[in-house]
């Protein structure tokens, strides 16, 4: 998905939270130098996904995927690509 | 840069009321099962997280959005 390319660390953290994998979340949060209180807060969100089971995680993942691939986001991604191309062309 | 619609979704998940969050989810996926799940998750997060927890989660988001990996 084009949007995942635009902010990979966001999707890393989101899917680590929604997946319920604490180790994966810790690894993702290390990439952004999260403090201990920040990790604790993110784990509380993760707990909600874990407590509500697999179906809940799948459904919320579906929502995020739908938003990320919606015209609201894809239009944004196309616009960003056009801007990048313009800058690259001007930079030559 | 993160898509504004995604940012809005995440912001509402953390700082909006359950009705506001579910309303926004409905704009993209209006299935009853999806909306019910969104409300359950939102209510859970609101029950678990203190004011300080939410400040810390928002701080993580700031770090994500300003990261070279974003």
């Amino acid at each position: 998905v084009k949007m995942a390319e635009t902010c990979p660390i966001f999707y890393d953290v989101f899917f680590a939270v929604a997946n319920g994998n604490e180790l994966l979340l810790d690894l993702s949060l290390t990439k952004v130098n999260a403090t201990e209180p920040e990790r604790t807060a993110m784990k509380k969100i993760q707990d909600c996904y874990v407590e509500n089971g697999l179906i809940s995680r799948v459904l919320d993942g579906l929502v995020m995927t739908t938003i990320s691939s919606s015209k609201d986001c894809m239009g944004e991604a196309v616009q960003n690509t056009v801007e990048d191309l313009k800058l690259n062309t001007l930079g030559r | 840069e993160i898509c504004p619609a995604v940012k809005r979704d995440v912001d509402l998940f953390l700082t909006g009321t359950p009705d506001e969050y579910v309303e926004q989810v409905a704009q993209y996926k209006a299935l009853p099962v999806v909306l019910e799940n969104a409300r359950i998750l939102k209510n859970c997060v609101d029950a678990k997280m203190t004011e300080e927890d939410k400040e810390n989660a928002l701080s993580v988001l700031d770090k994500i959005y300003t990261s070279p990996l974003c």
Epitope: - | P4, K7, R8, D11, L12, L14, T15, G16, T17, P18, D19, E20, E23, Q24, D46, M49, T50, E51, K54, E55, L58, S59, D62
Partner: antibody, heavy 119, light 107 residues
């Protein structure tokens, strides 16, 4: 100390414009949703607008939609209310108020700034 | 939009009286209701949120109850310093409508 201070009120003619400011201190401003609430002389409280911490979502009361614009500058810890096409019924004390993250209520209010719309 | 109606207004009571103010929403709002107190010439102050939770620093003579559409603010023993206008507000979603206010006076 958590504080909000409004400024920018004054006398303006009907159809005119005014920009109100709200300066915040004592808390991490960028994290908090902020409301504008107004109170006409001798009347009750009326909610006007809310802007989220990152400006990703904004809500307005129907009575001001299309005429008022709320914005914020997190680097300056400041909130703004641009009021255009002002009417006599917009005459009020305007308050900015912080919305809590946990319970979504207005826990901190500014002292208010008075806007008078009159010819 | 959901309407919020407060009653009675105004309200006159004696010191030591038990005072009750009611607030009704035109549709269910769960417990997303707050009560604010505004003393004459002062800024509004949060009293109660989530229908029944007392804000820190608020005297225990104040209490709130209700859920759905019908809510109540009670002052168990009215004090002279409670002279103020009381507003309920629904905050489940925008617009965050206030009730019209109940002006409380001492007899």
């Amino acid at each position: 100390e958590v504080q909000l201070v409004e400024s920018g009120g004054g006398l303006v003619k009907p159809g005119g414009s005014l920009r109100l400011s709200c300066a915040a201190s004592g808390f991490t401003f960028r994290n908090y949703n902020i409301n504008w609430v107004r109170q006409a002389p001798g009347k009750g409280l009326e909610w006007v607008s809310l802007i989220s911490g990152s400006s990703s979502y904004i809500y307005y009361a129907d009575s001001v939609k299309g005429r008022f614009t709320v914005s914020r500058d997190n680097a300056k810890n400041s909130l703004y209310l641009q009021m255009n096409s002002l009417r006599a019924e917009d005459t009020a004390v305007y308050y900015c108020a912080r919305r809590t993250l946990s319970y979504y209520v207005m826990d901190v209010w500014g002292q208010g700034t008075t806007v008078t719309v009159s010819s | 939009d959901i309407q919020v109606t407060q009653s009675p207004s105004p309200l006159s009571a004696s010191v030591g009286d038990r005072v009750t103010i009611t607030c009704r929403a035109s549709q269910g709002i769960s417990n997303y209701l707050a009560w604010y107190q505004q003393k004459p010439g002062r800024v509004p102050q949060l009293l109660i949120y989530a229908a029944s939770t007392l804000q820190s620093g608020v005297p225990s003579r104040f209490s709130g109850s209700g859920s759905g559409t019908d809510f109540t603010l009670t002052i168990s023993s009215l004090q002279p310093e409670d002279v103020a206008t009381y507003y309920c507000q629904k905050y489940n979603s925008a617009p965050y409508t206030f009730g019209q206010g109940t002006k409380l006076e001492i007899k």
